[in-house]
Amino acid sequence: AGVFELQIHSFGPGPGPGAPRSPCSARLPCRLFFRVCLKPGLSEEAAESPCALGAALSARGPVYTEQPGAPAPDLPLPDGLLQVPFRDAWPGTFSFIIETWREELGDQIGGPAWSLLARVAGRRRLAAGGPWARDIQRAGAWELRFSYRARCEPPAVGTACTRLCRPRSAPSRCGPGLRPCAPLEDECEAPLVCRAGCSPEHGFCEQPGECRCLEGWTGPLCTVPVSTSSCLSPRGPSSATTGCLVPGPGPCDGNPCANGGSCSETPRSFECTCPRGFYGLRCEVSGVTCADGPCFNGGLCVGGADPDSAYICHCPPGFQGSNCEKRVDRCSLQPCRNGGLCLDLGHALRCRCRAGFAGPRCEHDLDDCAGRACANGGTCVEGGGAHRCSCALGFGGRDCRERADPCAARPCAHGGRCYAHFSGLVCACAPGYMGARCEFPVHPDGASALPAAPPGLRPGDPQRYL
């Protein structure tokens, strides 16, 4: 277990020409807040997939009113860190989305209005327990500067927060079976710690962070008794018995998620999975439209002219995700056929074809034997994108132009002498051997170990190999 911490340093116009206008005005004062979404790994997850590592929403920043005629400065930020607690191991590699939101405080009918100012996304490697990492990301004309780190919650330690350490009880050594906790040599590895909150009476664990229930109890922390009577609308099945759960009050009762969000219980609270266009702890932040510029990397926003209609981003080749925020490894789709080498040039895919193949995707099999003559009665055989000649007896080489020496490979065994012949080779066997290649010994009593010599051919006579 541990906490991912994000510190926003500044949000304002990026360098270069075309500074953005301030998002707030005297007529329409506003304030900023931030949302961070974390997903494990560097995998190409769909952008709309849930923030599996966790998400957090900052407090609202100070109210800001633009000074007439002044360029947009760095905007006032909310106080404090954004903290995303993680329950299990820190994955080491993670994907993040940081969104900058504007809350307009003018005379809005029905309260304040929210709009997305900028969204940045990235993938990083980070060890827990390390120093703050600094980053700068640009979204259009805006620039976001921030730092982040992952730290373990005691007693967890290590780069993944999977090792558990406690202070030594004795000054010299750790308890039986427990090793010192490098690099914290003054601490010892701790016995297994179950998931935080796991019922000590009704739960147990075999792996750190898990909570397995004894029979008759269920729920993520084994605190919910299983009812043996049948029930019509159980909250969920029990892994321990076939009974039903006593409905009991739960964090998702009454569905705290607004705007059609779906609620799922977490050990400490609940999590809302929001439909496209809605964000926030309870999906209360709404109304992302094409006017908010949700499409990145040259994506075109289609539809979504008003808050009630969902937008779609048409992504340029090479990008995907609901906001075109993820680069596609187009070569991973293996578009080049017949063993061609794929090159993603950014503006286009190229296939470098093997010999004998052509076309944009190496899809055309060239006629390998077209215009290829095999000499001396050889025949052309296609295959593998290259032509090959099957040569007549006595000839070899790529085009059967070379006269083969049938004796070059020393084919006669047991000291037999080889003679080239117009139809192949002849082996003159040494005394005691026979066969086309002199491979069979002749027994002393005159019987051969294998088939008898053909009629009229005595052992020791030359054998012609056809």
């Epitope: 020409p17 075309g18 979204a139 259009g140 004309a141 094409c290 006017a291 908010d292 510029g293 499409c295 990145f296 040259g298 994506g299 075109l300 926003c301 289609v302 539809g303 048409h314 340029p316 080749p317 090479g318 578009p335 950014g346 503006h347 286009a348 895919l349 944009p360 995707r361």
Partner: antibody, heavy 118, light 108 residues
């Protein structure tokens, strides 16, 4: 070198369907979006629609009910059909390639004039 | 849809002079998704600038683009004889893709 060439009849009768084909050379049709744009004589440019080889299309709402864009990857071609034409559809019709950096047009055909007249 | 208004409609200048063409959007164009094209009589348009300020391949450096939000500018620092043409802006932030009405740069 990327080249685009429009082809199709230069004269179409009112209420009929205008059909044009764009043949692409020097680029794989599977690697880009492809678009049609038109320009009435002496006027500005109007985007008609685009297509991706996967079949994704997007049309200008002002023409959507009459437009169909299709693609033939085997011939490296894409086509435009505009139904129920009137004299207001008389224009030079351009086919163009959409760039990878965004939905702007980096290569254009030389254009073909289509006149709608009886 | 985003409506692009170009001004002036016609610009009469001499070779060697500086030309400044304006393109104003009815709504903010996000991430500066704006392109400029040049069109000569009887020819197809030619891409000059994309991303509001990035020059396309092979475009001379006398052409430059600037601006953000709703106001964009194409500047030709010293007009050459071959620069007299019609110039169009185009936004590609959201659908439908739209062009400005064009600015004709003619010889004075």
């Amino acid at each position: 070198q990327v080249q685009l060439q429009e082809s199709g009849p230069g004269l179409v009768k009112p209420s009929q369907t205008l059909s044009l084909t764009c043949t692409v050379s020097g680029a794989s049709i599977s690697s880009f979006y492809w678009s049609w744009i038109r320009q009435p004589p002496g006027k500005g440019l109007e985007w008609i629609g685009y297509i991706y080889y996967s079949g994704t299309t997007n049309y200008n709402p002002s023409l959507k009910s009459r437009v169909t864009i299709s693609v033939d990857t085997s011939k490296n071609q894409f086509s435009l059909k505009l139904s129920s034409v009137t004299a207001a559809d008389t224009a030079v019709y351009y086919c163009a390639r959409i760039a990878v950096a965004g939905f702007f047009f980096d290569y254009w055909g030389q254009g073909t004039l289509v006149t709608v007249s009886s | 849809e985003i409506v692009l208004t170009q001004s002036p409609g016609t610009l009469s200048l001499s070779p060697g002079e500086r030309a400044t063409l304006s393109c104003r959007a009815s709504q903010s164009v996000n991430k500066n998704y704006l392109a400029w094209y040049q069109q000569k009589p009887g020819q197809a348009p030619r891409l000059l600038i994309y991303g509001a300020s990035s020059r396309a391949t092979g475009i001379p450096d006398r052409f430059s683009g600037s601006g953000s939000g709703t106001d964009f500018t194409l500047t030709i620092s010293r007009l050459e004889p071959e620069d007299f043409a019609v110039y169009y802006c185009q936004q590609y932030d959201r659908s439908p893709l739209t062009f400005g009405g064009g600015t004709k740069v003619e010889i004075k």
